[in-house]
Interface confidence: low
Amino acid sequence: RTVPPMVNVTCSEVSEGNITVTCRASSFYPRNITLTWRQDGVSLSHNTQQWGDVLPDGNGTYQTWVATRIRQGEEQRFTCYMEHSGNHGTHPVPSGKVLALQSQW
């Protein structure tokens, strides 16, 4: 079976004009997934990103996340790239409210 992930991108403010953007994938199966941040379509170096472990979420599916820190006002330049079971999707940083997207393939 394949269960596509729910992808949720959120922002949280940090000091000095920076924000942390977090891309969360949840409720997916199997556990193998790729999440990475891109700036202007180019993948960020791994030393500028942090990943959470892929963990069971209690429903027979899995969850994980990737985060990076960016300058406030540059949110539109960043997207979260997700790849799961041969499918892929790109998810923008929300402007204003949290963006939650159910992947549709």
């Epitope: 199997p30 556990r31 193998n32 997934i33 790729t34 891109r38 379509g41 180019v42 993948s43 170096s45 791994h46 030393n47 990943w51 472990d53 892929v54 790239y81 790849e83 799961h84 079971s85 041969g86 499918n87 892929h88 790109t90």
Partner: antibody, heavy 119, light 108 residues
Framework: QVQLQESGPGLVKPSETLSLTCTVS????????GHWIRQPPGKGLEWIGM???????DYNAAFISRVTISVDTSKNQFSLKLSSVTAADTAVYYC?????????????WGQGTLVTVSS | EIVLTQSPGTLSLSPGERATLSCTAS???????LHWYQQKPGQAPRLLIY???NLISGIPDRFSGSGSGTDFTLTISRLEPEDFAVYYC?????????FGQGTKLEIK
Amino acid sequence: QVQLQESGPGLVKPSETLSLTCTVSGFSLTTYGGHWIRQPPGKGLEWIGMIWTDGWTDYNAAFISRVTISVDTSKNQFSLKLSSVTAADTAVYYCARKGHGYYYAMDYWGQGTLVTVSS
Amino acid sequence: EIVLTQSPGTLSLSPGERATLSCTASSSVSSSYLHWYQQKPGQAPRLLIYSTSNLISGIPDRFSGSGSGTDFTLTISRLEPEDFAVYYCHQYHRSPFTFGQGTKLEIK
């Protein structure tokens, strides 16, 4: 059956451009990414770069000024171009498939092709 | 650059014995991004274990992986003749995505 096959000239002159193609079968490059790796004779493995399923690339910074990886999904091929080669670029060049969610690991490899840089 | 140091450089053992191969990273590597490959003479490398401890389908369960942070281990519980080869660890945690220099497992 998953297969990858590297092809290209076995001999390249110094300062010229090394061009290799990886032809794949048993899967589609629209659903799997690809890596290029090289191995100088008698030495270890060195990652050159990769191409994602949607065509974006990541490169080893050591090569970034002279490397290009591209894909032609209609031919099920992805390619490596390495410019301004020197004798230090003599190596066996491998293409490999990026496994699904295997955290960029390479789950299938071509058999490799030896490229010698010499005048 | 994260440097992966494998030890020992060469390991001489007999079939039936247990092999323990070490991979030490110069800085911390997420367990998700540490992989092991096997390479036999004249052949391409083959993925054995991904994300530290996950065995690739078709790889015998005498192979196992463990570790975290900077210290990772590949263990072969009972060596078979076909296991004698060079083993590489590989990290895709931080660019450039490096390999260890390899451990050669040879027949004693």
